[in-house]
Interface confidence: low
């Protein structure tokens, strides 16, 4: 029986050109997490495999950074990044858990005040 629950950062907004952190956490289960997939609609953004580590899809490697934790950092946001993002936890023996985040990227009205940040 699947007893786990996924907590996410929910519905979030960010400015065009900025960066955002997407985070999920799987709780209430003792199942082993074997892999976490991050997907945008039907596109695979990144994979974090328990044994092999992170893999960022080539088409996103310039704008997606792994972490913190099993989360994902999206950089240089465009309005086309608006939409649903999914964290998909592959676990044993439970199976698959999915969390949903909706990101809205807003046109920047004060882009000259923008502050970038980095994930060490």
């Amino acid at each position: 029986m699947m007893t786990g629950t996924i907590e996410t950062t929910g519905n979030i907004s960010a400015e065009k050109g900025g960066s955002i952190i997407l985070q999920c956490h799987l709780s209430s289960t003792t199942a082993q997490v074997t892999q976490v997939n991050w997907e945008q609609q039907d596109q695979l953004l990144a994979i974090c495999n328990a044994d092999l580590g992170w893999h960022i899809s080539p088409s996103f490697k310039d704008r997606v950074a792994p972490g913190p934790g099993l989360g994902l950092t999206l950089q240089s946001l465009t309005v086309n990044d608006t939409g649903e993002y999914f964290c998909i936890y592959h676990t044993y023996p439970d199976g698959t858990y999915t969390g949903r985040i909706f990101l809205e990227v807003l046109e920047s009205s004060v882009a000259e005040h923008g502050a970038r940040f980095q994930i060490p």
Epitope: E7, T9, G10, N11, I12, S13, A14, E15, G17, G18, S19, I20, I21, Q23, H25, S27, L106, S108, V110, A111, H113, G114, A115, F117
Partner: nanobody, 117 residues
Framework: EVQLVESGGGLVQPGGSLRLSCAAS????????MGWFRQAPGKEREYVAS???????WYADSVKGRFTISADNSKNTTYLQMNSLKPEDTAVYYC???????????WGQGTLVTVSS
């Protein structure tokens, strides 16, 4: 709009401790997370720690085991307990919340932490 007010910074000797607080008011939400970033002179703003409202936490490698982030949801406040401080922790510390928050410029005013003997 979310207003974020940080406090608790100051001058501390290496090995000492400080506790930062960040109070959020205005258009706050019950979901999402709150986090801390810092910016040292001449460097980029960098991630320090964050906490989901349910209590799960993340830390930058440079502060793991020394810093503890927590949140009091009833007060819309997050805290950063900083122990075993090092000179390289000297920076202006900023808090943020990701719900209704525009990452480009909606930061609090920051609180300065100086670690020096």
């Amino acid at each position: 709009e979310v207003q974020l007010v940080e406090s608790g910074g100051g001058l501390v000797q290496p090995g000492g401790s400080l506790r930062l607080s960040c109070a959020a008011s205005g258009n706050t939400f019950s979901g999402g997370f709150m986090g801390w970033f810092r910016q040292a002179p001449g460097k980029e703003r960098e991630y320090v720690a964050s906490v989901l409202r349910g209590g799960y936490t993340w830390y930058a490698d440079s502060v793991k085991g020394r810093f503890t982030i927590s949140a009091d949801n009833s007060k819309n406040t997050t805290y950063l307990q900083m122990n075993s401080l090092k000179p390289e922790d000297t920076a202006v510390y900023y808090c943020t919340t990701d719900r209704g928050y525009n990452w480009n410029y909606d930061w609090g005013q920051g609180t300065l932490v100086t670690v020096s003997s």
